[in-house]
Amino acid sequence: ILGGREAEAHARPYMASVQVNGEHLCGGVLVAEQWVLSAAHCLEDAADGKVQVLLGAHSLSQPEPSKRLYDVLRAVPHPDSRPDTIDHDLLLLQLSEKATLGPAVRPLPWQRVDRDVEPGTLCDVAGWGIVSHAGRRPDRLQHVLLPVLDRATCNRRTHHDGAITQRMMCAESNRRDSCKGDSGGPLVCGGVLEGVVTSGSRVCGNRKKPGIYTRVASYAAWIDSVLA
């Protein structure tokens, strides 16, 4: 997260760290007792490493009573996701067992009504992604509030030049932005999960390259079918 601040500890009990061989790789969001939603491209970066999900964490390194690392029973990328595009960049991870719920571990309601969030709405994005252009990684969860940007502006030639489909949404990126390592994390508007940070090599913090988020409402049928 660029231009953000440290989150209040455990105030986002849905927040997950998707880890490979014990290292944070991507963000994720607990959407059901045994399921974490993340970004499909995160799996590509995992190679053949052991994928696990950390729940109940604020600090990645310090012991915390609520922290628990779960093995992944099943990884389900969206069937239409492709390595060379950010389209359909969603991944569902089934935990090896149901998460132990509590004040620091709780699923987040996700948007099912397929309607665009009003541009200008302030939404919260959180993650353990880099906090500087130099690539500094935080130990504790960071967050930032970002205004939603209308799709027509996001699709301008100076911005993402037509790459933003109806199944994506954008948020402003003027110094405050999601960045590398935040992919798969939640964009939360009004207490509801609206978007998932897409993974990719997008420049961060540049106002002309807004953050791109996969709209979960557009994938309600797929999410329901996997969770069923």
Epitope: A152, T153, N155, R156
Partner: antibody
Framework: EVQLVQSGAEVKKPGASVKVSCKAS????????MYWVRQAPGQGLEWIGE????????NFNEKFKSRATLTVDTSTSTAYLELSSLRSEDTAVYYC????????WGQGTLVTVSS | DIQMTQSPSSLSASVGDRVTITCKAS??????VAWFQQKPGKAPKGLIR???SRYSGVPSRFSGSGSGTDFTLTISSLQPEDFATYYC?????????FGQGTKVEIK
């Protein structure tokens, strides 16, 4: 298939107004700005302005700001350019074009201003 | 306003020739430059965006380069269908502006 289909040729008298339409199909109309360009006979291309069909926000070339009005009808996916106080030098082909992604342009509308 | 000065204004060339058209911006426009081809009585057709990225379906003989203030469109081997007028456009700043055009004619 993306298409921008413009209204037919117009002949107007000096001082009158003209309204040119541009009907979009094959994509989500509100997801892309629409801009307008004109080309006088034998001349180059001149940007008039643009409109965000989602919000209605507009940006204009200062030269046209006082005389040009850009509007949209999202229910019919149509963009409009209205130019008022026409003079002979406004005789030109007027084009609409989608801003972003592939460079889609309308076929052009010839507006002739003559007394 | 940013002026886009295109040169030459016209040129004569033969099929198979390598043709280079330049465009100079009066101030820095990063890589926010597009190139268009226009044939008589037709709407302009996009060739290049972001100074060097070809639009889909555009033959590989067309290439663009440059950043800042100096930009080039190159046709590596001119084909009969390439005889047309070419325009550069900057979209970095309002108002968007075009070069005055380069007419490529048959020698």
């Amino acid at each position: 298939e993306v298409q921008l289909v413009q209204s037919g040729a117009e002949v107007k008298k000096p001082g009158a107004s003209v309204k040119v339409s541009c009907k979009a199909s094959g994509y989500t109309f509100t997801s892309y700005y629409m801009y307008w360009v004109r080309q006088a006979p034998g001349q180059g291309l001149e940007w008039i302005g643009e409109i965000n069909p989602y919000s209605g926000d507009t940006n204009f070339n200062e030269k046209f700001k006082s005389r040009a009005t850009l509007t949209v009808d999202t229910s019919t996916s149509t963009a409009y350019l209205e130019l008022s106080s026409l003079r002979s030098e406004d005789t030109a082909v007027y084009y609409c074009a989608r801003e972003g992604g592939f460079a889609y342009w309308g076929q052009g509308t010839l507006v002739t201003v003559s007394s | 306003d940013i002026q886009m000065t295109q040169s030459p204004s016209s040129l004569s060339a033969s099929v198979g020739d390598r043709v280079t058209i330049t465009c100079k911006a009066s101030q820095n426009v990063d890589t926010d430059v597009a190139w268009f081809q226009q044939k008589p009585g037709k709407a302009p057709k996009g060739l290049i965006r972001s100074a060097s990225s070809r639009y889909s379906g555009v033959p590989s003989r067309f290439s663009g380069s440059g950043s800042g203030t100096d930009f080039t469109l190159t046709i590596s081997s001119l084909q009969p269908e390439d005889f047309a007028t070419y325009y550069c456009q900057q979209y970095n700043n309002y108002p968007l502006t075009f070069g005055q055009g380069t007419k490529v004619e048959i020698k």
